[in-house]
């Protein structure tokens, strides 16, 4: 995943002695809040493991890498990185891991510059449908957004709300359409069942989409025909059984894709053939070799390229009148 | 029925090279990859390797990628491991196993002792 | 990658007792199997997808769990049930990982 990062050698650290001494003036515009790490010579802030369970007010102006990183932060609040002078420069936002469970509508709002968002590792309980498009409208303004991390953002079953978890993400990827011009998203480890077939059509600019270690039984809704600059498709780890027609032609039609479909589950029965015959001929899926047959057991860990129409067969349904007890 | 056969000793010198065989049959050799295992007295089960025989594709654990080297010959349905610079470390029993998810079916095991 | 650690290390039981041994798992797996190894003699397959007897298996072993943390119970031991029993973690693409095995001797 592709988390802000830094080059940053040398970091001025705001000593937590001074923090009582320096708030009772007006902050200056390019100070260290307390218990974070600044390089202004990297345009980088870190505050990471700090238990924090806000955002500092008094983030410098430069700050181009912010890491809020290992942190108590729960709610991200409307307008949550607001300032005046506004953070103009800020382009990478690295949340991940900060014990949040809520996002409001607008929490990114006034952040002209933001490319890269991580709010991974985040039991998010409830994300507004307007966390990143900032207002309710049928159409936003665009979002400047073209990374969003969003690995391991479910929460545990029992504090989720009573709605679809799948649903909740994609609406906030979806509101405004403010996220056209997102080229990579994440989406790993989060328990989805199901992809809502609308998500993808709207999110036309994709290049990288990871969906690996969900539990995905099924792409048979899902479309992406209109992913024609997705370039890499990671679908390892999933609940996966097999890829139909439809989905076999649409990935092929897409001119720069790199498909992952390692670790899933695949029943070789008479269903698999023209995944089979697709495999053969296809060279989108990387390690395609490695794909081998989870049942039935006579089946189990053969080389789904090393099998062939007679290999695969359905045992018949028999009609209720020959079926034993 | 499946059978992977290995020789049940090899006695090599510390230094030198060894190649041990994995022989198959009861099955479609080219249809399922083959792993390697190796397993120290009293110890525990640690993956080598594998080979993919239809193609030969390997993937290694990182702790043996200069230790050993995978290699098939289909008209024989034989696997190879090659240990190479051997010490007494490497003096153990390693196992060819069938498998995918799993690993379904495994050999005797071949007992390697490096011994001056 | 995922670490498996299988408790206890050396257990032992009486004929007829029930045994149970855990695998514990240091991130979430969707399943594990079960290989037992009886001295002197190769690996087997024993239980598969944490929970499927292979053909042979006699049902007093079944295999249990979710997420991190699985077993392996014998609801009766047998003397021929005493063997070195390994976990390792459901997967198609390397490494391929096992447990640190559990010795399960008769009393």
């Known amino acids: 995943s592709s988390s802000p990062t830094s080059s940053a050698s040398s970091f001025s650290s705001s000593a937590p002695f001074l923090a009582s001494a320096v708030s009772a003036q007006p902050p200056l515009p390019d100070q260290c809040p307390a218990l974070c790490e600044c390089s202004e010579a990297a345009r980088t802030v870190k505050c990471v493991n700090r238990n924090l369970t806000e955002v500092p007010t008094d983030l410098p102006a430069y700050v181009r890498n912010l890491f809020l990183t290992g942190n108590q932060l729960a709610v991200l609040p409307a307008g949550a990185f607001a300032r005046r002078p506004p953070l103009a420069e800020l382009a990478a936002l690295n949340l991940s891991g900060s014990r949040l469970d809520e996002v409001r509508a607008g929490a990114f709002e006034h952040l002209p510059s933001l490319r890269q968002l991580d709010l991974s590792h985040n039991p998010l309980a409830d994300l507004s449908p307007f966390a990143f498009s900032g207002s309710n409208a049928s159409v936003s303004a665009p979002s400047p957004l073209v990374e969003l991390i969003l690995n391991h953002i479910v929460p545990p079953e029992d504090e989720r709300q009573n709605r679809s978890f799948e649903g909740m993400v994609v609406a906030a990827l979806l509101a405004g359409r403010a996220l056209q011009g997102l080229r990579r998203l994440e989406l790993a480890s989060n328990h989805f069942l199901y992809l809502p077939r609308d998500v993808l059509a709207q999110l036309p600019s994709l290049r990288h989409l990871d969906l690996s270690n969900n539990s995905l039984v099924s792409l048979t809704y899902v479309s992406f025909r209109n992913l024609t600059h997705l370039e890499s498709l990671h679908l390892e780890d999933n609940a996966l059984k097999v890829l139909h027609n439809g989905t076999l032609a649409e990935l092929q039609g897409l001119p720069h894709i790199r498909v992952f479909l390692d670790n899933n589950p695949w029943v070789c029965d008479c269903h698999m053939a023209d995944m089979v015959t697709w495999l053969k001929e296809t060279e989108v899926v990387q390690g395609k070799d490695r794909l081998t047959c989870a049942y039935p057991e006579k089946m189990r860990n053969r080389v789904l390229l090393e099998l062939n129409s007679a290999d695969l067969d359905c045992d018949p349904i028999l009609p209720p009148s020959l079926q034993t007890s | 029925q499946v059978q992977l056969q290995q020789p049940g000793t090899e006695l090599v010198k510390p230094g030198a090279s060894v190649k041990l065989s994995c022989k198959a049959s009861g099955y479609t050799f080219t249809s399922y990859w083959m792993h390697w295992v190796k397993q120290r007295p009293e110890q525990g089960l640690e993956w080598i390797g594998n080979i993919n025989p239809s193609n030969g594709n390997t993937n290694y654990n990182e702790r043996f990628k200069s230790k050993a080297t995978l290699t098939v010959d289909k008209s024989s349905s034989t696997a190879y491991m090659q240990l190479s610079s051997l010490t007494s470390e490497d003096s153990t029993v390693y196992y060819c196993?069938?498998?995918?998810?799993?690993?379904?079916?495994w050999g005797q095991g071949t007992t390697l002792t490096v011994s001056s | 990658q995922v670490v498996l650690t299988q408790s206890p290390a050396i257990m032992s039981a009486s004929p007829g007792e029930k045994v149970t041994m855990t695998c514990s798992a240091s991130?979430?797996?969707?399943?594990i199997h079960w290989y037992q190894q009886r001295s002197g003699t190769s690996p087997k397959r024993w239980i598969y997808?944490?929970?499927k007897l292979t053909s042979g298996v006699p049902v007093r072993f079944s295999g249990s769990g979710s997420g991190t943390s699985f077993s392996l119970t014998i609801s009766s031991m047998e003397a021929e049930d005493a063997a070195t029993y390994y976990c390792q973690q459901w997967t198609s693409k390397p490494p391929w990982t096992f447990g640190g095995g559990t010795k399960l001797e008769i009393k």
């Open positions: 196993a069938r498998g995918g998810w799993d690993f379904d079916y």
């Open positions: 991130s979430s797996v969707r399943y």
């Open positions: 997808d944490t929970s």
